[in-house]
């Protein structure tokens, strides 16, 4: 008795976080025996789409010419071989940016900070939002994700960092979102350059949760130590 068909691999190019109006291609890679590929979108009638395999039959392309709110969400794919349907792929979360106006990102007391001192990055939105994300350029994952406790909407979120080391230096952006769909984010804030000066080099801050990624240690989430989130917001890791 043969075991279940191996699950396919699902990914998006150029990535899974796409600006509104930009194109994205979803790929599903199975085996050379695949006869058909199926893509399912959570909370949409299944199958969401079907495609014949591209030669040499081990993958299929699902094209999205222009990203819109409707495409944002969680996807899984399957392939059909002569012996039946495969297991589902691991989910792909397709996130759209540009759903809301961009927040403002600032550093308190200043974006120029001495190593060993404290700094707070402040993300402010014009309209009340309940989720805020802080992103560091070239990081593989959001650094921090602050979500309001009881659906209470906030105009801002604070991301305290203490003590600051050279690892914290770099370019940051933040996004805001509504809880009803964490697949829809605002336009990114303008970039903020955090400059760490001085030689008070303490130990590297270590993440409170390990993240499986092929990237180097600089790309791991940085958990500010001894910090308290903005009132009404709780820290939440994606």
């Amino acid at each position: 008795q043969a075991g279940p068909l191996p699950k396919p691999t699902l990914w998006a190019e150029p990535g899974s976080v796409i600006s509104w109006g930009n194109s994205v291609t979803i790929w599903c890679q199975g085996t050379l025996e695949a006869r058909e590929y199926r893509l399912d979108k959570e909370e949409s009638p299944a199958p969401w789409d079907r495609q014949n395999p591209l030669e040499p039959k081990n993958k299929a392309r699902f094209s999205i010419p222009s990203m819109t709110e409707d495409y944002a969400g969680r996807y899984r794919c399957y392939y059909r071989s002569p012996v039946g349907w495969s297991q589902p792929s691991d989910p792909l979360e397709l996130v759209m940016t540009g759903a809301y106006s961009k927040p403002t990102l600032s550093a308190l007391p200043s974006p120029l900070v001495t190593s060993g001192k404290s700094v707070t990055l402040l993300c402010q939105s014009r309209s009340p939002m309940d989720t805020f994300l802080l992103i560091k350029e070239r990081a593989a994952h959001p650094l921090l994700h602050l979500r309001s406790e009881h659906g209470a909407q906030q105009h801002q979120a604070e991301f305290p960092m203490s003590p600051v080391t050279s690892v914290h230096g770099g370019t940051y952006r933040c996004f805001s979102s509504h809880g009803f769909s964490h697949y829809l984010l605002s336009h990114p804030s303008d970039p903020l350059e955090l400059i760490v000066s001085g030689s008070l080099e303490g130990p590297r801050p270590s993440p409170t949760r390990s993240v499986s990624t092929a990237a180097g240690p600089e790309d791991q989430p940085l958990m500010p130590t001894g910090s308290v989130p903005h009132s009404g917001l709780r820290r939440h890791w994606e």
């Epitope: 930009n22 010419p65 222009s66």
Partner: antibody, heavy 123, light 107 residues
């Protein structure tokens, strides 16, 4: 069957604002990109911009500073405003539709077009 | 911005001839390409989308191929009613640029 109909003044004075409306009849505006295209006399097609039913827009970079496209889904229409017009803006202006989502059929090219309205910029 | 370049700008062929029009994108656009036919004094009409998918109601003598940067529109057997200007257009990320057009005439 979906039909598009452009309307607006055929003559606009230089430096003034060109305003056109596209009336959408026989179908829904949801999940489509609603586009404006123009064609100067004897020349090719030029894409101006589009609006999605959510209100998000994209414009041709060369016109970005002068163009605004808006939508009123309750009245089934979308509009074009082009400020500070010159003789170079004289053209036939078309409105057109492109499918925006798998559920809406053709999500490729501009599959439904209005008949076009001629706009002349002159004093 | 990505530029779309069509060639030739015009051509003259006999009824029954095979006619080929090419469109080149300055950067890759996957298969996000449409072809339109515009007869003199008329509204443009969608012929092909997704580079090779024939729009409903379009005669099968029209076909499209290509992906990435190079695309082709072929009329397998030119008919008198095919006299028109043909445009390619990219429709992925904005701007949705058109090619400059190819005018097709009968010899």
């Amino acid at each position: 069957q979906l039909q598009l109909q452009e309307s607006g003044p055929g003559l606009v004075n230089p430096s003034k604002t060109l305003s056109l409306t596209c009336n959408v009849s026989g179908g829904s505006m949801s999940n489509y990109f609603w586009s404006w295209i123009r064609q100067p006399p004897g020349k090719g097609l030029e894409w101006i911009g589009y609006i999605y039913n959510s209100g998000n827009t994209n414009y041709h970079p060369s016109l970005q500073s002068r163009v605004t496209i808006s939508v009123d889904t309750s009245k089934n229409l979308f509009s074009l405003k082009l400020t500070s017009v010159t003789a170079a803006d004289t053209a036939v202006y078309y409105c057109a539709r492109r499918g925006g989502y798998y559920g809406s059929g053709n999500y490729g090219g501009l599959d439904v077009w209005g008949h076009g309205t001629t706009v002349t910029v002159s004093s | 911005d990505i530029q779309m370049t069509q060639s030739p700008s015009s051509l003259s062929a006999s009824v029954g001839d095979r006619v080929t029009i090419t469109c080149r994108a300055s950067q890759g656009i996957s298969n996000y390409l449409a072809w339109y036919q515009q007869k003199p004094g008329k509204v443009p009409k969608l012929l092909i989308y997704a580079a090779s998918t024939l729009q409903s109601g379009v005669p099968s003598r029209f076909s499209g191929t290509g992906s990435g940067t190079d695309f082709t529109l072929t009329i397998s057997s030119l008919q008198p009613e095919d006299v028109a200007t043909y445009y390619c257009q990219k429709y992925d990320s904005a701007p949705w640029t058109f090619g400059q057009g190819t005018k097709v005439e009968i010899k």
